[in-house]
């Protein structure tokens, strides 16, 4: 139950965190003009991975799209590219973990075909968010550099008379969804391989039996036979009982594709 | 069609306060900025304050902080400007204009003018 | 606040001659953003209000006969007039449009000779 939870709670904190890494790669507002201490101008200016958008006082917003891919900076590709990568990778993980899902009967699916699953969609998910916080964190460290860069050469000029006025830009909303998304998603990868876990098959040490041809006694020898574990086996576990002294129920303590919730 | 119609010449003591008004039709008052404008006789124009009726969001020409007070009446789709402890030098023609949308933070249409007189 | 200064300050011409008259501002009204220049020109006739020509700085306002042109970026702005008409004969206001507090340029008159 406690494992079904956990693989649940990470696919729909996953789902979530995705769902946000979308949205940031989507929005416009990455950057934004910065209004601190600076000439307040009628009309703000914002970015996005995609476009710059321009809003005048009459709330008038015009967008015009980076409609070059050579021209552009490389560390806003390498932004584009670990965004695109972790929404990707995180499409892929959801994918898969729809069917490792504990709670949904996929024909004769095993258990351990289903921790497999669950692992793999946990490092989709785990890697998506990395993605994710690494691509806000480099536009980020960009736009901090940016920004003291122009707060440097603020007002440009010729014969030291100001001729302009250059537009510093700060950290806009995208940024903060992108980095909680990736949270996210990240948390949501963890829980997948803690769920792996439970979900599969343990170690267990079950008491094997002996048999003696030779006497009429019946002699029970501890130890010795391990189940059968590891992700890519099929193999069913043998379960060999000390003389019926526990319940079927006592012994299979571990879930298996006949557990529903 | 857009239309700003303001009220008439006003003559007042130093000291005193007027309210200037400013009705609009033609358009959804509630969706576009309003600005204030003085001209003095002979000389050029200059921006006072603009006010967003939607929310009575304003911005004032620091130079007229305290001098000019705008308020909105969106039943009526009207607009005031306050002027108070007014002097010789607040003699002037003020033009109510609406700021048009997607022109440039540009004032579209005017008002005919309000002539503010201060005398003793 | 950004000054704006325009030169002439009048002038005086004849019907059908080509007006070129200035508007210079303190700071450039260029928004990098968009590329657009945030300056604005009115008409203003005698007893009238202003009236909207161009905003930024070049795109003509509907009605506005195409005889005006307006041009320039940065911090220098130029209204022409390719052949003046009686009816053109009224003050020419530039405007910062970009900076808060909104200023204006003290006017060119245009006269009849």
């Known amino acids: 139950m406690a494992v079904t939870a956990c693989q649940g709670l990470g696919f729909v904190v996953s789902l979530i965190g995705i769902a946000g890494i979308i949205a940031a790669t989507c929005m416009d507002q990455w950057s934004t003009q910065d209004l601190y201490n600076n000439p307040v101008t009628a009309v703000f200016n914002y970015q996005g991975l995609w476009r710059s958008c321009v809003r005048e006082s009459s709330g008038f917003t015009e967008c015009r799209g980076y409609f070059t891919l050579l021209g552009l900076p490389a560390m806003l590709q390498a932004v584009r590219a670990l965004m695109i990568v972790g929404i990707v990778l995180g499409a892929i993980g959801l994918l898969v973990s729809i069917f490792a899902l504990k709670c949904i009967r996929i024909g004769s699916m095993e258990d351990s075909a289903k921790a497999n699953m669950t692992l793999t969609s946990g490092i989709m998910f785990i890697v998506s968010g990395l993605c994710a916080i690494a691509g806000v964190s480099v536009f980020a460290n960009m736009l901090v550099t940016n920004f003291w860069m122009s707060t440097a050469n603020m007002y440009t000029g010729m014969g030291g008379m100001v001729q302009t006025v250059q537009t510093r830009y700060t950290f806009g909303a995208a940024l903060f969804v992108g980095w909680v998304a990736g949270g996210l998603t990240l948390i949501g990868g963890v829980m997948m391989c803690i769920a792996c876990r439970g979900l599969a098959p343990e170690e267990t040490n079950y008491k094997a039996v002996s048999y003696h041809a030779s006497g009429h006694s019946v002699a029970y020898k501890p130890g010795g036979f391990k189940a059968s574990t590891g992700f890519g086996s099929n193999t069913k576990n043998k379960k060999i009982y000390d003389g019926g002294a526990r319940t079927e129920d006592e012994v299979q303590s571990y879930p298996s594709k006949h557990d529903y919730v | 069609q857009v239309q700003l119609k303001q009220s008439g010449p006003e003559l007042v003591r130093p000291g005193a306060s007027v309210k200037l008004s400013c009705k609009t039709s033609?358009?959804?008052?509630?969706?576009?900025?309003i600005h204030w404008v003085k001209q003095r006789s002979g000389q050029g124009l200059e921006w006072v304050v603009r006010i967003y009726p939607g929310t009575g969001n304003t911005y004032y020409n620091e130079k007229f902080t305290g001098k000019a007070t705008l308020t909105a009446d969106k039943s009526s789709s009207t607009a005031y400007m306050q002027l108070s402890s007014l002097k010789y030098e607040d003699s002037a023609v003020y033009f109510c204009?609406?700021?048009?949308?997607?022109?440039?933070?540009?004032?579209?249409?005017w008002g005919q003018g309000t002539s503010v007189t201060v005398s003793s | 606040d950004i000054v704006m200064t325009q030169s002439p300050s009048s002038l005086t011409v004849t019907a059908g001659e080509k007006v070129t008259m200035n508007c210079k501002s303190s700071q450039s009204l260029l928004n990098a953003g968009n590329q657009k220049n945030y300056l604005t020109w009115y008409q203003q006739k005698p007893g009238q209000p202003p009236k909207l020509l161009f905003y930024w700085a070049s795109t003509r306002e509907s009605g506005v006969p195409d005889r005006f042109t307006g041009s320039g970026s940065g911090t220098d702005f130029t209204l022409t007039i390719s052949s003046v008409q009686a009816e053109d004969l009224a003050v020419y206001h530039c405007q910062n449009a970009y900076y808060y507090p909104y200023t204006f340029g003290g006017g060119t008159k245009l006269e009849m000779k």
């Open positions: 033609g358009y959804i008052f509630t969706n576009y900025w």
């Open positions: 204009s609406r700021e048009g949308y997607g022109k440039g933070n540009s004032m579209d249409y």
